[in-house]
Interface confidence: medium
């Protein structure tokens, strides 16, 4: 199931995925002056089996004599819902990216690709936020957002991050910490990505729920 909307916007912050869940689509977009080759794919698709995931299809751009009129593909699933596209600033390759089951790594750049990548995320996808250059991160909780679904309606959880206008950059999980840092940061914030993006739940689990009751009378 594709996510209806884009991940939430945090002022002075950008987000990225460390790995992409199977089913994720990446539009084959070309930079100005280039277009997708006629026989080329509209998008790349993260597919795989139990042991290995990879991107199907290859994006190819060719020079265009006319203005770039490449259509943006918005995949329509069975439900025919309108899907918004998600823009990613120039692709950033995380350092030592964890190899998660059922996930693809950041696809390598293709020749003459557009400066922005447009992903179509699926339910269960997690993205991580960092403050842009010149802003410092204040964490009230995890600086991440997950796409979840309730009765077929998708939503992104709200990342607990505020970026303040102080000169210090915040890092994505798995990225190198700057040499000089005005204040010590917990090691956990810069450690490699943990496998929290795998949302498969055992269907055979025994779930129990006990309810109890309290009442309060107004005096």
């Amino acid at each position: 199931e594709l996510c209806d909307d884009d991940p939430p916007e945090i002022p002075h912050a950008t987000f990225k995925a460390m790995a992409y869940k199977e089913g994720t689509m990446l539009n084959c977009e070309c930079k100005r002056g280039f277009r997708r080759i006629k026989s080329g794919s509209l998008y790349m698709l993260c597919t795989g089996n139990s042991s290995h995931s990879s991107w199907d299809n290859q994006c190819q751009c060719t020079s265009s004599a006319t203005r770039n009129t490449t259509k943006q593909v918005t995949p329509q699933p069975e439900e025919q819902k309108e899907r918004k596209t998600t823009e990613m600033q120039s692709p950033m390759q995380p350092v030592d990216q964890a190899s998660l089951p059922g996930h693809c790594r950041e696809p390598p750049p293709w020749e003459n690709e557009a400066t922005e990548r447009i992903y179509h995320f699926v339910v269960g996808q997690m993205v991580y936020y960092q403050c842009v250059q010149g802003y410092r991160a204040l964490h009230r909780g995890p600086a991440e957002s997950v796409c979840k679904m309730t009765h077929g309606k998708t939503r992104w959880t709200q990342p607990q991050l505020i970026c303040t206008g102080e000169m210090e950059t915040s890092q994505f999980p798995g990225e190198e910490k700057p040499q000089a840092s005005p204040e010590g940061r917990p090691e956990s914030e810069t450690s490699c990505l943990v496998t929290t993006t795998d949302f498969q739940i055992q269907t055979e689990m025994a779930a129990t729920m006990e309810t109890s009751i309290f009442t309060t009378e107004y005096q």
Epitope: E1, K81, G124, M149, H151, F199, I201, A207
Partner: antibody, heavy 106, light 110 residues
Framework: PGATVKISCKVS????????MHWVQQAPGKGLEWMGL????????IYAEKFQGRVTITADTSTDTAYMELSSLRSEDTAVYYC????????????WGQGTLVTVSS | QPVLTQSPSASGTPGQRVTISCSGS????????VYWYQQLPGTAPKLLIY???QRPSGVPDRFSGSKSGTSASLAISGLQSEDEADYYC???????????FGGGTKLTVL
């Protein structure tokens, strides 16, 4: 009537924060009425218009317990209240509690 | 008054095929998935169909769901006495921003 009731729902057998927690009302001999939900991961709630302002749904991740508080009780609130979980990847309320009967009488 | 409309009752004989319908609008069934729940007498509801036509593990293939426009149907083939229950349809409603249920259909196996 006029009182507030708070029902708790303790779960086990799965990771509490991976599922939404819904609350559903069923008056005697009547159908199901959705009251609202909480996402235990971030505490975000969505309430049904009918119960807005009278219902508060919360989740305590330290005890894997969800709560539903209904205020300004009236006789028509006499019902069985179910807590029920929904897989956030599949959708659909797939595990239901046994229900708690609340009787409002003067 | 329930947002989704179901006929209050339906009946059939063992082995027969029965269909329960659920009617909504463009803001619920028309643009979102439909879910079906079975409530046996004196018990909590149970998820029967999700995402219009998918069966959770453990639900017999005698139960099938379908959707067309702003209406949905639950079909039960090879009716059995243990299928006697109340059946509810549900969907997300974009206008109300929440889950809406049908009024329920009481199925009697004659």
């Amino acid at each position: 009537p006029g009182a507030t009731v708070k029902i708790s729902c303790k779960v086990s057998g799965y990771t509490f924060t991976d599922y939404y927690m819904h609350w559903v009302q069923q008056a005697p001999g009547k159908g199901l009425e959705w009251m609202g939900l909480v996402d235990p991961e971030d505490g975000e709630t969505i309430y049904a218009e009918k119960f807005q302002g009278r219902v508060t749904i919360t989740a305590d991740t330290s005890t894997d317990t969800a709560y539903m508080e209904l205020s300004s009780l009236r006789s028509e609130d006499t019902a069985v209240y179910y807590c029920a979980t929904e897989d956030t990847a599949m959708g659909g309320i797939d595990y239901w509690g046994q229900g708690t009967l609340v009787t409002v009488s003067s | 008054q329930p947002v989704l409309t179901q006929s209050p009752s339906a009946s059939g004989t063992p082995g027969q095929r029965v269909t329960i319908s659920c009617s909504g609008s463009s803001s619920n069934i028309g643009s979102n998935y439909v879910y079906w729940y079975q409530q046996l007498p004196g018990t909590a509801p149970k998820l029967l169909i999700y995402s219009n036509n998918q069966r959770p593990s453990g639900v017999p293939d005698r139960f099938s769901g379908s959707k067309s426009g702003t209406s949905a149907s639950l079909a039960i083939s090879g009716l059995q006495s243990e299928d006697e229950a109340d059946y509810y349809c549900a969907a997300w409603d974009d206008s109300l921003n929440g889950v809406v249920f049908g009024g329920g259909t009481k199925l009697t196996v004659l």
